[in-house]
């Protein structure tokens, strides 16, 4: 039997996943967005500024189980999912409301993972098999990068990461956090 699906903090149901999930469905369908964060309102202002420092991107908290063959993590892990296009920071809270999204006419701006952290997970296996320990790579922050028409994705231009950093005061080396800090983060996610 498969593992039960579960709810994450963005209200959607997430089935079991491998170590790295596919981008979850809420990235393309705003119906499952965290309503408290989204508000469901369209952007109030058209995009005008060209100031790079105002570019930012959405960081969605995503909770999932780690699986390895028939084994599944004892507890879910929480990481960020970097959402779609980038827009001016001042519009971000409402930027995806009602399916609307700012899109540049020239270069493509993408929100991609910036920093990662490592977290050890305990995998429980069926049939009395001994638990396994695994260290997984989790997205810790996102950033905007610019992709021009003349470049492929390997040549994304860094837009400066400060505007896209999580607002929770993450340290420069987010993976060097204690197990207690990671546990607290998980517990606070529910």
């Amino acid at each position: 039997q498969g593992w039960q699906a579960f709810k994450n903090d963005a209200t959607e149901i997430i089935p079991e996943l491998g170590e790295y999930p596919e981008p979850p469905p809420e990235l393309e369908n705003n119906k499952t967005m965290n309503r408290a964060e989204n508000g469901g309102r369209p952007p109030h202002h058209p995009f005008e500024t060209k100031d790079v420092s105002e570019y930012s991107c959405r960081e969605l908290h995503f909770t999932r189980y780690v699986t390895d063959g028939p084994c599944r993590s004892a507890k879910p892990v929480t990481e960020l999912v970097c959402s779609g296009q980038c827009g001016p920071a001042r519009l971000l809270p409402n930027a995806i409301g009602r399916g609307k999204w700012w899109r540049p006419s020239g270069p493509d701006f993408r929100c991609i993972p910036d920093r990662y952290r490592a977290q050890r997970v305990q995998l429980l296996c069926p049939g009395g098999e001994a638990p396994r320990a695994r260290k997984v790579r989790l997205v810790a922050s996102c950033k905007c990068k610019r992709l021009t028409r003349f470049h492929n994705q390997s040549e994304l231009k860094d837009f400066g990461t400060e505007a896209a950093r999580p607002q929770k005061g993450r340290k420069p080396r987010p993976r060097a956090r204690s197990a207690k800090a990671n546990q607290a983060e998980l517990e606070n996610a529910y």
Partner: antibody
Amino acid sequence: QVQLVESGGGLVQPGGSLRLSCAASGFTFRSHWLSWVRQAPGKGLEWVSNINYDGSSTYYADSVKGRFTISRDNSKNTLYLQMNSLRAEDTAVYYCARDTYLHFDYWGQGTLVTVSS
Amino acid sequence: DIALTQPASVSGSPGQSITISCTGTSSDVGDINDVSWYQQHPGKAPKLMIYDVNNRPSGVSNRFSGSKSGNTASLTISGLQAEDEADYYCSSYGESLTSYVFGGGTKLTVL
């Protein structure tokens, strides 16, 4: 079972280009990071590049940055390495490896790239 | 990333135990980063033998074990067998968790 099969290697002149492919099977391709690792004749292993599960983030060793491009097609379960401006020092066996849990748990058999005039 | 340091060669007789060291810096091996070990027979692809310092993948003999002290990780092979003769590489990941560094490799000869 997990299988990774590289192809596309061969003899190329300095300054030339080559595209390597790695066909994967036996696992959920889109759920894993993947890497290219190379080994020059008689030398050790050198990590070249990796790519995250959906291809949105790519990373390179300094020695290949700006010349090599890693990409993936999740619909075809295939990993690629586009190698441009090749140099003699790029001569090596190139392995694709599944980059899972911060180590390489499965490797392909490798494909030889020879850069020579 | 600077390569990890391994001895070029080690040797031992069948039935003996040998240890291969892998020395890094505080930002790779010595940090919370974990070390993995790979075995490579001539003309073959590398095979994962140890991950996360001291964990064995299923199918790997329990004669192989790993440990770490400070900036040095070690691979110990007990009860040496002829088929253990191969090159062994240690590896760790960089600070960003997106790059990797390998040791120069150690040739194990079973006398």
